[in-house]
Structure formats: structure tokens, C-alpha cells
């Protein structure tokens, strides 16, 4: 295999330090150059790479949405960590948005788990102890945590 540069690569910006690949791979925090000869550092706060790689670019940092708090910032080796604000949660099957936690359980059920950034409140039937599936009950059937306040819909 031969290599020919038709156009020289742009000189690396000061924050893009270069080093040599090891067995064709660059370490976390870097990506590889087109010709495979150099490892170029990711730009802090802009992009990152978590593993040894031979990719042409680093991955773009996640920006926390409104309704989320930033637990840790993006570094060259780790993406931003975002978490839903208090009173909201993100489900595995709908990770694109934080949803409001219900304020209470349906009639005949008791709360056994609090609202966390990862889960809604958990309700079980008083007698059987079986979990509630999570559908929002009709307002009139709701036993709320503070009297007179209807449960928030999961939207």
C-alpha cells in the first residue's frame, strides 16, 4: 500500500496535541489522522473519545437539555453526564426526555418507592403487594400525597 498526500492536512490548533498511534490505535481523548500517523487530541468541552480507537474524529459532547442538570462536564475522555431535575425522571424506554413524577398513588395502593432521576414513584396494591403498571389513574381515583392536589400526568 502506498500513500500520497494530495493536500497537506491543516496544522493542528494549539489544543490539538499530536502523538503517535500504538498499533494503529489512538488512546482515549484522541482521534487518528487521515494518514494514520498521528493521534490528535479531542477539544476539551467540545468532543471526546472514551476508548482506544482509529476514528477520524472525536464524538461531540452532549449538551444537557433544559429540565436537566449537569452532574459532570464533558472532558476529552468522558461525555457530559446529565440528570433529570428533581421531581422528574427518565425511563429507559423513552430516554429522550425527562417526565414528571406522579405526585401520588391510585386509590387502594401505597407508595413504596420515591421519585428518582431514573424512576417514577413506585406503587403497590395494599393487599397483594403487586406493583402498579404506571398508567395514570383518573383524577377522582387518585390518592394524592397532599390533599386536593391531583396527580401529574406522565408527560
Amino acid at each position: 500500500i502506498t500513500q500520497q498526500d494530495l493536500a497537506p492536512q491543516q496544522r493542528a490548533a494549539p489544543q490539538q496535541k499530536r502523538s503517535s498511534p500504538s498499533e494503529g490505535l489512538c488512546p482515549p481523548g484522541h482521534h487518528i489522522s487521515e494518514d494514520g500517523r498521528d493521534c490528535i487530541s479531542c477539544k476539551y468541552g467540545q468532543d471526546y473519545s472514551t476508548h482506544w480507537n482509529d476514528l477520524l474524529f472525536c464524538l461531540r459532547c452532549t449538551r444537557c437539555d433544559s429540565g436537566e442538570v449537569e452532574l459532570s462536564p464533558c472532558t476529552t475522555t468522558r461525555n457530559t453526564v446529565c440528570q433529570c431535575e428533581e421531581g422528574t425522571f427518565r425511563e429507559e424506554d423513552s430516554p429522550e426526555m425527562c417526565r414528571k413524577c406522579r405526585t401520588g398513588c391510585p386509590r387502594g395502593m401505597v407508595k413504596v418507592g420515591d421519585c428518582t432521576p431514573w424512576s417514577d414513584i413506585e406503587c403497590v396494591h395494599k393487599e397483594s403487594g403487586t406493583k402498579h403498571s404506571g398508567e395514570v389513574p383518573a383524577v377522582e381515583e387518585t390518592v394524592t400525597s397532599s390533599p386536593g392536589t391531583p396527580a401529574s400526568p406522565c408527560s
Epitope: 494530495l6 493536500a7 482509529d54 474524529f57
Partner: nanobody
Amino acid sequence: EVQLLESGGGEVQPGGSLRLSCAASGLTFPNYGMGWFRQAPGKEREFLAVIYWSGGTVFYAESVKGRFTISRDNAKNTVYLQMSSLRAEDTAVYYCAVTIRGAATQTWKYDYWGQGTLVTVSS
């Protein structure tokens, strides 16, 4: 969705020339390489050349260096393979492919492939 469409294949006499084109759509990567491969009946797919979008870096296989030239048109998102001094052994299906890896001269480094265009060199 990434789509690659090759064109320009056909029948040519030994010593003749042909230019293949590969039009790409759906590519949203910050940088990528577009490469050409070929596969003759009963043989493995063979790397020919690759050109990178940002820096224009090019790699060729020894078997085609000096006879084949790869080039690109950024505005059209198209890569070309100019083939000259064609021989009977150049008969194969020619494939265009996209990589997001550096120095990609191996088949496994390519993630997206076109359907291929047949080149027949025969007198």
C-alpha cells in the same frame, strides 16, 4: 441513511480507459474516507484506493498505483476512479465504500457499501 451509487462500469478493450463515479448521500460525519474496492469471481474483495474528505489524503494499492487515480468533487459529494491501461485481470465488480477510520486500506474498516458496478476488460 447513507446511500452510495456507483456508475460508469461497462465493457472496454485491453489498454483502454474507464472512469467510475460514486455519488454519496446521507453522510453527516465531520470527516470520512471514500474508497474503491473490486471483487473478481471466486476471489476476495480487494482494496484499490481511498481518498479522505477533509485533508484529501490518498492511499493506493500497489497493484493499481500509476494506472488508477482517485479523486473527489466535494460539492457533488462524489468520488471518481480513473482507470487506464486496463487489463483482462482488472475484470471485476467495482465497489465504492465509506470509512470513518484513518489509513483504511482493509475491507473491515468500511461501514457503508454501494451495490457495485461491473467492469469487463475483453477483446
